[in-house]
Each structure stands twice: as C-alpha cells, then as structure tokens.
Interface confidence: low
C-alpha cells in the first residue's frame, strides 16, 4: 500500500516569494509522484518545479498559483494510486495603479460646486487600507468638505471648489506591504474671480530709438486689475510715468508700448494681474537693447593650389546673436560647391590660383552690421630669374652670389655654405632679392654654396662653387718691433702667400747688405750671435709675378734679458709690525718693477701711508694687519721682456709668553723683527 508520510497543507504565501508544498510517500514498489492543480497535471517550469516529491515555488504568482494542489503517487507496475489531501495558498499581494476620475465622466465636466469622485486603483489581498494625499499632504476624513473612507478606495469631494485644486495621489497597505499610485490626478477647478493669464508678455530685443511692445492680458469675473512695473518697482501708468519712461503708453487691452527706446529703458518689466480674490499673478519680460561688437581682425592667409582650406569667422558678440555669412567680390557664397560657406567657416576645396583675393565675413543683427576682410593668397612654386653661378671672388673684397626668383607670395631665400645654413652676421648678408653678399672674402670661403627659394607651395634650389683669388699677404704679418737677446742666437721669421708662391728676402732699411753672420734662409732671418750692431730697421719683401711685391718693416732691438738679483722670500710678520719684501732686477733696457698683491697691481700713486715701493724695487708694508696676508708678486719688465717672481706674506698674532718660558725664548717660527 502507498502511504503519505508528509502531506501538503494549505498555507499563507507572499506574491513573488519562495514557497514549498511538501509531499513524502512510502511504498513497497517503485512509485512515481506528480502534482495536480485543480485536477490538471502540473508541468515543471523554472518558477514552479518538483523537488523530490515536493512542489517548489521560486516565486509565488497570485494568478498562476491560485487553486487546489494535490500530490499523486502511482505505482506504475500495480496501477495502485494514492492522492494527498488538497492544499492551497492564501496569497498576499499588493499592486500599484493610477488615480482615476470616477465622477463626472470626463475632466471637461468638472465645474465649481459639482461633486467629484476619484478612485485609487491599488489592489491587493488582504484588502488594503487607503490613504489619500493632495499636493503630498495627507487628507483625513471629513477634512475641508471631503468625504473620505480610509477603508475604501474612493475620495469624494462634495461640493468641489477652487480650494480643492491640486495633485491627488493615494497609497495603500496590507499584510503584504505598501504601494502608492503609479499615476496621479491633477484636479484644476478655476475660481472665476482669480486672475488668469490670457496673454503673457515676451522678452524683446530692440535697436536703440526703435519701439518695443509688451502684450499682457488677464481674465476674471469681475474683470481683473492690470498694472505694469519697471525694474525698481516703479508703476507705469498713462498719468504717472517715471522720468526715464516718458515715452511709455499703456493701452486699454493691457499692452505696453515704449517708443524711442534708450539704454536706460532696458530691464525687467512686470505685468501684474489682480482678481477680486486670489493672489496677484506676476508676469515678467525683459527688454534688451540690441548690440553688436566689433569683429576680430583676420591675419592674411596663404594657401597652396589643390589643397582644401578653411577660414573660421568668429562672430562678434551681440544681441540677438548675429547671423554670419561670407562674401567674395560682393557675392554671397553658397552653402555647397567648391568654394562655399559651412556654418561660420569659409571652405575652399581644391584651391585654384583664381581663388586668391579678398573674402569678407559679414555679421548682422538688429543693432547693425559688422564686416572683416581676409586677404587670401594662393601660393605658387618659385621660378628662376637668375641662378647662382660658379664664381671667382677676390680675397679681402666683397663678393656676390645671386639667387633671383619670383612667386606668390614673395619667396623666402635661404643660403647654405657647405650644407650649413648661413645665418646673417658681420660677414654675410642676404638682400631682400635673395642675393648673398660676402663681406671681406676670406680664403676658406672657397667652397660650395646653395640657395633655396621657398613659398608654401614648394621650393627650388641651385648651387654654385666659389673659388677665392688669394691676395699677396704676409702669413702672419711680422711683428713691427722685436727684441733679440744680446750674445745669443736669434731668428726672425717672415712668410707670405699669394695666387702664386711668392719669393721672400730680407734687407736692411738703409739698403746696406746683411753681415756675414746673418743669413736669410727662405724668409727666416738668422743671427748666429747677436751683437749690439744688429739692432736697427729691417724690411721683409714678398713678391710674385702676377701680384708684384709687398713689404713689412721690422725694428729689431738688441737687449740683455731680465734676471733677478734679489727675489722676495716667504715672510712671516707679527700683526702691527713692518714687513719688507725685497726685489731687484737687472737687464737692458733697465727694467721697471711693479708689485702685485693679492691678485691686483699695487699702484705706487695710490698706495696710502702704510705701503711704499723703494727705488731699488723693494716693497715695505707698515703696521701689517691679517688682511695683508697673501701672495705678493714682483714683476720686472722692459720693452723686450717681462719676468716675475712671487712669495707669500703671513701676518700672525704675537704670542703671550707662558710662565714656563724664559723672557728671551725665540718665537716658534722665523720672524722679521722690527
């Protein structure tokens, strides 16, 4: 026999929530269990399905799960079948709906003093309790002539008046939960004595000295009052106009006319309607004075043929917003084609040379018109008028290389020397026509030059070789005054260059021949052993066939070079004592001595009372201070040479004798005692 161990039982359930109808059977043979709903087999779905022998509900549905469920166990072998007790759900639910007009039949039939009934279409089980709201505020039973039943879904307003106007909504709750109306109802019951807007004034923009009209109308029973105010609450009537509104007229129909509008008339105008009852109705409109600013300037534009270009016209600020259009040769541009206007842009597609010229952007509004021209140049690739030529330039003179081209716009020309860009300086100058001037041509200017002529459309280039015709010159020019050391070997060099290698020879300025111990070896004057008689004026002569000769005069002096007889020594002196730095030099001509102390020359005329330089060259410093410490340099010089020697000076504090030392103890370092 089939026995039910657990049978399904009726139970409460919540809409959309889980539920389970239990069923467990015991039988000797293999039984198969299925479920019936109102006698019909239950098909498994994702929402409702058998779980073992029980029936599981993922989400209870009040429509699909209403009825009687029964668990059936069947032994397919014996044909025995057993059925469980019936079970059903008590499904709790609530569902939102709109607030609808129940009476009268349509909104058009709602009149003051008629009965109005609204119905709240929120349904549920168990039966919900309802709450009504007007403009979000709860309504209670009997409040302000409403008859409201909180158990019922109807709200009756008897009689309905203007004070009942508002947005009606409802909410309801039951054991399942709460819901509020999905769509609310706006009740509008006009009070004939309230001012109602018929015609509202609109903002206006007018040009200076033009007229402006504001229209304003209200209706009510009895007819309402209408008043105009300006900005500072100044009333405007035909009898009393404020000084700045002398030209204002209020018409019988409520319209306000302002003639010959001035800037001071601009502002907010208020039209106020007041019925016998109810609040004043205030309408605002603004009078703007039309204005238009100047347009920014365009930079001239250069475009290349075949390209597409756009020029944006920034409209001037203005009220109302100015309209913008482009013109060329007095004709407004179309909105499509090859040259056309797109928004505020001038578009030139596939530019031709003929497109060059002046294009004008116009902007206009009530306040006037503005315009701005843009000059468009269509660039062409440069062509040659004169290319640079291979040239021979003379050293030391200015040289010119030409690069003459023509194009639109005027081409820019740059020059390169040995592939390096030539920047203009004191030696190179590029003229406006493209010619390169080399001031004072030098030997190393002999190289390749290249000029490039460019416009936005393209560039052309050409190059030329410069050969420098070298002048006859000494390299380097001999020093005009030179010294030779007595009784020593000496050389005086002289070299020169030219277009052809020059020959070089020396002679004495008086024309006498050189002594036998003096030789002229390929331009170098050589003295085996200098004597006093070798002093004098000599001339170096360089010459070649094509360029003639050049001369350089040299005065040679014979001198005994400087040596120091006495050199200054490293010296340490007590503060406040006197320092002596000795220095003596000899030579011919007799050398002069200068001292340099702490990196500056000591000027004998500006030494002050503490310092003195003796005739023999020694330097004395009285009352020495720590700041006198440093390196002192003795410089001996004459017209032929210069020598220097240096020694440091240390200034120290005199030590206080300690008791252990005898009165005659020597200082711990070598001192000058004064």
């Amino acid at each position: 026999a089939i026995v039910f161990i657990k049978q399904p039982s009726s139970q409460d359930a919540l809409q959309g929530r889980r539920a389970l109808l239990r069923c467990e059977v015991e039988a000797p043979g293999l039984v198969h269990v299925y479920w019936l709903l109102d006698g019909a087999p239950v098909q498994d779905t994702e929402r409702r399905f058998t779980q073992g022998s029980s029936l599981s509900f993922a989400a209870v549905d009040r429509l699909q799960d209403s009825g009687t469920f029964q668990c059936v166990a069947r032994d397919d072998v014996t044909g025995e079948e057993a059925r469980s007790a019936n079970a059903s759900f008590n499904i709790k639910w609530i569902e939102a709906g709109p607030v609808v007009l129940k009476h009268p039949a349509s909104e058009a039939e709602i009149q003051p003093q008629t009965q109005v009934t609204l119905r709240c279409h929120i349904d549920g089980h168990p039966r919900p309790t309802y709450q009504w709201f007007r403009d979000g505020t709860p309504l209670s039973d009997g409040q302000s002539n409403n008859t409201v039943s909180s158990k019922e879904r109807n709200l009756t307003l008897r009689p309905a008046g203007p004070e009942h106007s508002g947005l009606y909504s409802c909410c309801a709750h039951n054991a399942f939960g709460q819901a509020c109306s999905s769509q609310n109802f706006t009740l509008s019951i006009a009070d004939e004595s309230f001012a109602r807007v018929v015609l509202a004034p609109q903002d206006v923009i007018v040009a200076r000295n033009e007229e402006a009209m504001f229209h304003c109308q209200f209706s009510a029973q009895p007819p309402p009052n209408l008043q105009w105010l300006f900005e500072d609450e100044t009333p405007i009537t035909n009898r009393s106009r404020p000084p700045h509104l002398r030209r204002a007229t209020v018409f019988a129909n409520g319209s306000l006319l302002l003639t010959q509008v001035r800037p001071r008339n601009a502002g907010v105008y208020r039209c106020i309607g007041q019925g016998q009852r109810g609040p004043p109705v205030i309408l605002e409109a603004t009078l703007h004075l039309a204005e238009i600013e100047d347009m920014p300037l365009f930079e001239p534009r250069v475009f290349t043929a075949g390209s597409e270009e756009r020029v944006t016209c920034l409209p001037p600020k203005g009220l109302p917003e100015p309209s913008v259009w482009w013109e060329h040769a007095g004709v407004r541009l179309p909105t499509h084609g090859r040259v056309y206007q797109k928004g505020h842009e001038l578009v030139l597609a596939s530019i031709a040379e003929s497109d060059a010229g002046v294009y004008t952007c116009h902007a206009a509004n009530l306040a006037g018109q503005r315009r701005q021209d843009v000059n468009i140049t269509v660039a062409t690739v440069p062509t040659w008028l004169k290319k640079p030529q291979d040239s021979q330039l003379e050293e030391g003179k200015p040289g010119y290389l030409h690069c003459l081209t023509q194009a639109t716009p005027k081409p820019t020309v740059v020059w390169y020397r040995n592939q390096m860009l030539i920047s203009e300086d004191s030696r190179f100058e590029v003229f406006k026509n493209g010619t390169l001037r080399i001031n004072n041509v030098e030997v190393y200017d002999g190289t390749w030059y290249r000029c490039v002529s460019s416009t936005p459309a393209g560039s052309i280039e050409a190059q030329a070789r410069v050969q420098v015709l070298e002048k006859l010159k000494f390299t380097p020019p001999p020093q005009p005054q030179q010294c030779m050391e007595f009784d020593k070997e000496a050389t005086v060099p002289c070299s020169a260059t030219g277009r052809e290698k020059p020959t070089i020879k020396w002679e004495r300025a008086d024309g006498s021949s050189l002594p036998e111990w003096v030789t002229d070896n390929a331009g170098t004057l050589h003295f085996a052993r200098v004597t006093r008689d070798d002093a004098g004026n000599y001339t170096c002569i360089a010459s070649n066939g094509p360029q003639g000769q050049i001369r350089a005069h040299v005065q040679l002096t014979v001198a005994v070079f400087i040596t120091f007889k006495v050199e200054p020594e490293r010296t340490t002196v007590y503060q406040g004592h006197t320092a002596l730095l000795q220095c003596e030099a000899q030579g011919d001509p007799k050398p002069l001595i200068q001292w340099k102390g702490k990196d500056r020359i000591l000027d004998p005329t500006k030494l002050g009372p503490r310092m003195h330089i003796f005739q023999n060259g020694s330097l004395v410093i009285h009352d020495v201070a720590p700041e006198d410490s440093g390196r002192y340099t003795c410089i001996a010089g004459n017209s032929c040479n210069i020598k220097h020697t240096e020694a440091p000076l240390y200034v120290v504090d005199k030590p206080v004798p300690e008791e252990s030392e005898g009165p005659g103890s020597p200082p711990p370092y070598k001192m000058i005692q004064t």
Partner: antibody, heavy 117, light 107 residues
Framework: EVQLVESGGGLVQPGGSLRLSCAAS????????MHWVRQATGKGLEWVSG???????FYPGSVKGRFTISRENAKNSLYLQMNSLRAGDTAVYYC???????????WGQGTLVTVSS | DIQMTQSPSSLSASVGDRVTITCQAS??????LNWYQQKPGKAPKLLIY???NLETGVPSRFSGSGSGTDFTFTISSLQPEDIATYYC?????????FGGGTKVEIK
C-alpha cells in the same frame, strides 16, 4: 537632454520601398546637419546620407539615386526614403547629429530594416 | 571618394596593456578625422574629433594623433569596459565614410 528616436523599420521585399523617420528633441534641430548611418549584422558602420542646415543633401555612390534624405525643421524630424531596396540594404539604420566639431556626437538607438523575399 | 584602411581588424590584449590602432587615408585629409567606440548592441559613441581632441566626458586614457594620411588611436591602459569595436571616420569634402573597424578583446 538630446534624444534621437528612429522608427519605420521592418520587413520589405526586394525592389520595395520604406520610409524611416527620426524624431529629435532636446536641441535646436534646425541648427545641425543630420545623417543616416547603417550597420549590417556583424559588419562595420556605413555612412548612408547627410543633409545640412540649408537642405543640401549628400550620398555615397552605393545609395545615390535610390535613397532620399529630407528634414522637416518645424516637426524636428529627419527622414530617409528608401526605394528599389536590395538584400544588401538589410541593416540597423541609425540617425546621428553632426556636432560643431564635425563628429557624430549623438546617435539614436537604431531601427532594423530587413529586405527579404 | 576617400578610402580608409584601418588595422588591425581585431586584437586581443591584457588589462593594463597599451593598445594602438592605425588608420590610413587614401589622400591627404589634414586632421579631419574622428574616432568612435561601439559596444555590442549599442550605438557608436564619439571619442575623439579633429584627430587628437578628446570629446567631453571621455577618459584621458584614450588619445589620438596624426595628420595628412596616417593616424593613430591609443588606449594607454586597457580596461575591461573598453571591450568594443573602434572605428575611424574622415570628414573631408562632405563625405563621411568609416574605416573597417578594429575589434578589441581582453586576453
């Protein structure tokens, strides 16, 4: 908020006609160029036509002579009249607004056109 | 008409990777190029206009560059929400043909 809503799509036989509409809101319709773009299933975007603020129209070669774009500024509406339809015209058709930056800055959700016998 | 060659047609990258897409125009279009993102089942969205300008509200990891005929679109650090197809679009001479698209997937 800018909104573009296409309508008028559906099933049509080869050689037939269909008229698509695009309702615009949330911007000054008359101030903007408007365009139609289509996309066949699993394929890329294909520009179909455009109309500027003056009513000038533009088409690629693939639809020229068969499709006509138009606009009704008073109704904030854009239209695409499609004649002599072919199977290759099957696609989702989008309407798009061309912004001042020349990009299609707002698009509709699309309407499906199926050309099949 | 201008032809646009977009490559690659698809790519797979890891989160955080730098992703680059290129678009080549058959003629000089200056900087007149837009980039769009289209997620499955959605309308395209404008990301970049005039080759390199970011549309308002678009994250700064998206960028574009190039002018003339060669253009590049870059996602500096790929995010899961960037899975989409990306299209380039020129707008020269009143024509608005799109590139073939690049499908971006996460490895």
């Amino acid at each position: 908020e800018v909104q573009l809503v296409e309508s008028g799509g559906g099933l049509v036989q080869p050689g037939g006609s269909l008229r698509l509409s695009c309702a615009a809101s949330g911007f000054t319709f008359s101030s903007y160029d408007m365009h139609w773009v289509r996309q066949a299933t699993g394929k890329g975007l294909e520009w179909v036509s455009g109309i500027n603020t003056d009513g000038d129209t533009f088409y690629p070669g693939s639809v020229k002579g068969r499709f006509t774009i138009s606009r009704e500024n008073a109704k904030n509406s854009l239209y695409l009249q499609m004649n002599s339809l072919r199977a290759g015209d099957t696609a989702v058709y989008y309407c798009a607004r061309r912004g001042w930056n020349y990009g299609f800055d707002y698009w509709g959700q699309g309407t499906l056109v199926t050309v099949s016998s | 008409d201008i032809q646009m060659t977009q490559s690659p047609s698809s790519l797979s990258a890891s989160v955080g990777d730098r992703v680059t897409i290129t678009c080549q125009a058959s003629q000089d279009i200056r900087n007149y190029l837009n980039w769009y993102q289209q997620k499955p089942g959605k309308a395209p969205k404008l990301l970049i206009y005039d080759a390199s300008n970011l549309e308002t509200g678009v994250p700064s990891r998206f960028s574009g560059s190039g002018s003339g005929t060669d253009f590049t679109f870059t996602i500096s650090s790929l995010q899961p929400e960037d899975i989409a197809t990306y299209y380039c679009q020129p707008y020269d001479n009143l024509m608005y043909t799109f590139g073939g698209g690049t499908k971006v997937e996460i490895k």
